[in-house]
Amino acid sequence: VSITKCNSDMNGYCLHGQCIYLVDMSQNYCRCEVGYTGVRCEHFYL
């Protein structure tokens, strides 16, 4: 799978994580920080 950094317009897309662009799948993906979940890393869990 080809990946690259997200475009600058997606700054802030991932609330608590790193935004990765999955080129072949035509979509952005959030790699969440520890303790966060959700499509955009918006949920905190203990």
Partner: antibody
Framework: QDQLVQSGAEVKKPGASVKVSCKAS????????IQWVRQAPGQGLEWMGR????????KYREKFERRVTITADTSTNTAYMELSSLRSEDTAVYYC?????????WGQGTLVTVSS | DIQMTQSPSSLSASVGDRVTITCKAS??????IAWYQQKPGQAPRLLIQ???TLQPGVPSRFSGSGSGTDYTFTISSLQPEDIATYYC????????FGGGTKVEIK
């Protein structure tokens, strides 16, 4: 199956406002950005602006900044685009477009006609 | 705002010809360019994103290339069903469409 269903065609008088809705099904708009694009008859595509429904943040093309308002109601999974002070040049098909989780998934378009 | 200058605005070619359309951005868009095909009365159809990644179901005669500010869209062998208007779109910093290229059969 993911869908963006837009409201029906509108006819408006110059100076009036129009509000176009875009209802999402099959996905949560909070996971995406919703863009708005328009196309006047026989003309090219023109990006108007977008909303991040999760945060409520909006960005607009400079030429529309004073006249357009993009909103989202996450409880009904619906985005809206309101354009005020309509003039004849605003006659166009208006599209909502999902981006973020999937690159550019388009609604069917809404024709807005501005005529006296 | 980033400006996208697309050329030519129209072209006429024969079936089987190679067709090339270019888009020049006013600043580096880091390969974040997509290409759309639009036929009359239809919504635009995404052909290519991230400069050269073909969407599923799109024929391999369509291709894209480029980097920095200069990008190219190519139809290697024009077919009658390719008659349409083609648009580039930069999506690095917000979004801007090129002016479009109307492709006709000679």
């Amino acid at each position: 199956q993911d869908q963006l269903v837009q409201s029906g065609a509108e006819v408006k008088k110059p100076g009036a406002s129009v509000k176009v809705s875009c209802k999402a099904s099959g996905f949560n708009i909070k996971d995406t950005y919703i863009q708005w694009v328009r196309q006047a008859p026989g003309q090219g595509l023109e990006w108007m602006g977008r909303i991040d429904p999760l945060r409520g943040n909006t960005k607009y093309r400079e030429k529309f900044e004073r006249r357009v308002t993009i909103t989202a109601d996450t409880s009904t999974n619906t985005a809206y685009m309101e354009l005020s002070s309509l003039r004849s040049e605003d006659t166009a098909v208006y599209y909502c477009v999902r981006s973020g989780t999937l690159f550019d998934f388009w609604g069917q378009g809404t024709l807005v006609t501005v005529s006296s | 705002d980033i400006q996208m200058t697309q050329s030519p605005s129209s072209l006429s070619a024969s079936v089987g010809d190679r067709v090339t359309i270019t888009c020049k951005a006013s600043q580096d868009i880091h390969k974040y360019i997509a290409w759309y095909q639009q036929k009359p009365g239809q919504a635009p159809r995404l052909l290519i994103q991230y400069t050269s990644t073909l969407q599923p179901g799109v024929p391999s005669r369509f291709s894209g290339s480029g980097s920095g500010t200069d990008y190219t869209f190519t139809i290697s062998s024009l077919q009658p069903e390719d008659i349409a208007t083609y648009y580039c779109l930069q999506y690095d910093n917000l979004r801007t469409f090129g002016g479009g290229t109307k492709v006709e059969i000679k």
